[in-house]
Interface confidence: low
């Protein structure tokens, strides 16, 4: 009896064994088809949405990179409360898991545009570099399933990047103007959005609690209209000491006014800078290494 | 680009006033704080107070109170400060710059009183 | 109101040589210091601001540090061009109050 109970524990064992063999063996075969997969898209069509088949939804990039999928590019995300899927830029580099809220490369896309193309998005959502917006209904939807980190990658044009991290990104609904939330911040590029760099501005600069405005809806703190001017939306305050959405200027200081895509406290209001990402992923995300 | 574009040298006899103007342009003048910034010959760098040019809200240190009253006219970008009942002590060049972190500087206005 | 000092008025150094500045605030005042230079006819030049951060298109060696009420800013490799007066000065409360300045003269 005590050599059958043994035995059993063996086989157990092995089967464990086994069954972790065959995960790592899935996730590679995952890899490998996504490779493949992205060396088609390299060789010119890059406008395809990596199709994971109809095995379940996914709430965001972090789900998709903890089944196993660990290549970045456009995939289909429905948030808990989203009423439909949408596709999304999932970064799985850094750390992986990242959803793709904003990027900005090369000034190809407009977004000198009103409430409506800002609550819906807009952009290229199917080239690696493409400019786009994901849309303030989508990012409401998103950051209230859970708690997000928003992490905000920069690079000027002098080839020189820094970042800058916030805790608990949220941004409210519809019935608050999609109102900007963030928590402790963290970082190389000091903390733009929330003013703190300087008691003098804090109170007319802060992007802390910032209803969202365009050009056609404005919910500034400004006596004019600050997204007119600065010819974005974002959450403006009287007006900004960020706006990433700002006018792409080919060029570092070629801005004539403080309207380019400033993050103040790493070059300034008037320089422009070369390129902006804005990525999200929840808290506690820990990548599921098999 | 930021310019701040200052009045010239002004020689003014002791007690008299004198006003000296700080024309903007390359933002929305009405965004940023305007400050003035006094400096004597071979000494150091004093503030005199701000001024917000969206609502003339002022603020001054309690050292010029009385001696300089601060002002805007939005229509023209241009910021102003006036010196009063003007002494020795008052020669100095005189700066109107951008908060914060004053990054961006006029290029200065010489005030020489003498009798 | 808070007071800056820079205990060096003068500071005499070598091109290529290394060279701090300090400045001693009479109260904590966090990071809210800036550094500015002004050569000789010139306006002011803002250097670095929160105590550490260099202004865009100032060169890497101006650096700055400290926190509380000791602050330091540093020229590694001195150039001629670097032949200035060099100004602290706090924005933690007002009324803003700059150091008395430190010229730094090249041998």
């Known amino acids: 009896l005590e050599d059958c109970a043994q035995e059993q524990m063996r086989l157990r064992a092995q089967v464990r064994l086994l069954e972790t063999r065959v995960k790592q063996q899935q996730v590679k075969i995952k890899q490998l088809l996504q490779e493949n997969e992205v060396q088609f898209l390299d060789k010119g069509d890059e406008n395809t949405v990596i199709d994971l088949g109809s095995k379940r939804q996914y709430a965001d990039c972090s789900e998709i990179f903890n089944d196993g999928y660990k290549l970045s590019g456009f995939y289909k995300i429905k948030p808990l409360q989203s009423p439909a899927e949408f596709s999304v830029y999932c970064d799985m580099s850094d750390g992986g898991g990242w959803t793709v809220i904003q990027r900005r490369s090369d000034g190809s896309e407009n977004f000198n545009r009103g409430w409506k193309d800002y609550e819906n998005g807009f952009g290229n959502f199917v080239q690696k570099h493409g400019e786009y917006w994901l849309g303030n209904k989508n990012l409401h939807f998103l950051t209230t399933q859970e708690d997000y980190t928003l992490k905000i990658d920069l690079a000027d044009f002098e080839k020189n990047s820094r970042y800058a991290q916030y805790k608990n990104f949220k941004v409210g609904d519809e019935k608050n103007f999609y109102e900007l939330n963030i928590g402790e911040y963290s970082g190389t590029a000091g903390d733009s959005l929330a003013g703190n760099f300087h008691p003098e501005v804090q109170w007319w600069a802060s992007h802390q609690r910032m209803k969202f405005s365009t050009w056609d809806r404005d919910h500034d703190n400004y006596e004019g209209n600050c997204a007119e001017e600065d010819q974005s939306g974002w959450w403006f305050n009287r007006c900004h000491s960020a706006n990433l959405n700002g006018v792409y200027y080919s060029g570092p200081y070629t801005a004539k006014t403080d309207n380019g895509i400033v993050w103040y406290t790493w070059h300034g209001w008037w320089y422009s800078l070369k390129s902006v990402v804005m990525k999200i992923r929840p808290n506690d995300f820990i990548p599921n290494v098999i | 680009e930021v310019q701040l574009q200052q009045s010239g040298p002004e020689l003014e006899k002791p007690g008299a006033s004198v006003k000296m103007s700080c024309k903007a342009s390359g933002y929305t003048f009405t965004r940023y704080w305007m400050h003035w910034v006094k400096q004597r010959p071979g000494q150091g760098l004093e503030w005199i107070g701000m001024i917000d040019p969206s609502d003339s809200y002022t603020s001054y240190n309690q050292k010029f109170k009385g001696k300089a009253t601060l002002t805007v006219d939005t229509s023209s970008s241009t910021a102003y400060m006036q010196l009063s009942s003007l002494t020795s002590e008052d020669s100095a060049v005189y700066y109107c710059?951008?908060?914060?972190?004053?990054?961006?500087w006029g290029q200065g206005t010489t005030l020489t009183v003498s009798s | 109101d808070i007071v800056m000092t820079q205990s060096q008025k003068f500071m005499s150094t070598s091109v290529g040589d290394r060279v701090s500045v300090t400045c001693k605030a009479s109260q904590n005042v966090g990071t809210n210091v800036a550094w500015y230079q002004q050569k000789p006819g010139q306006s002011p030049k803002a250097l670095i601001y929160?105590?550490?951060y260099r202004y865009s298109g100032v060169p890497d060696r101006f650096t700055g540090s400290g926190s509380g009420t000791d602050f330091t800013l540093t020229i590694s490799n001195v150039q001629s061009e670097d032949l200035a007066e060099y100004f602290c000065?706090?924005?933690?409360?007002?009324?803003?109050?700059f150091g008395g300045g430190t010229k730094l003269e090249i041998k």
């Open positions: 000065q706090q924005y933690n409360s007002y009324p803003l109050t």
């Open positions: 710059t951008l908060r914060p972190g004053l990054d961006y």
């Open positions: 929160s105590a550490s």
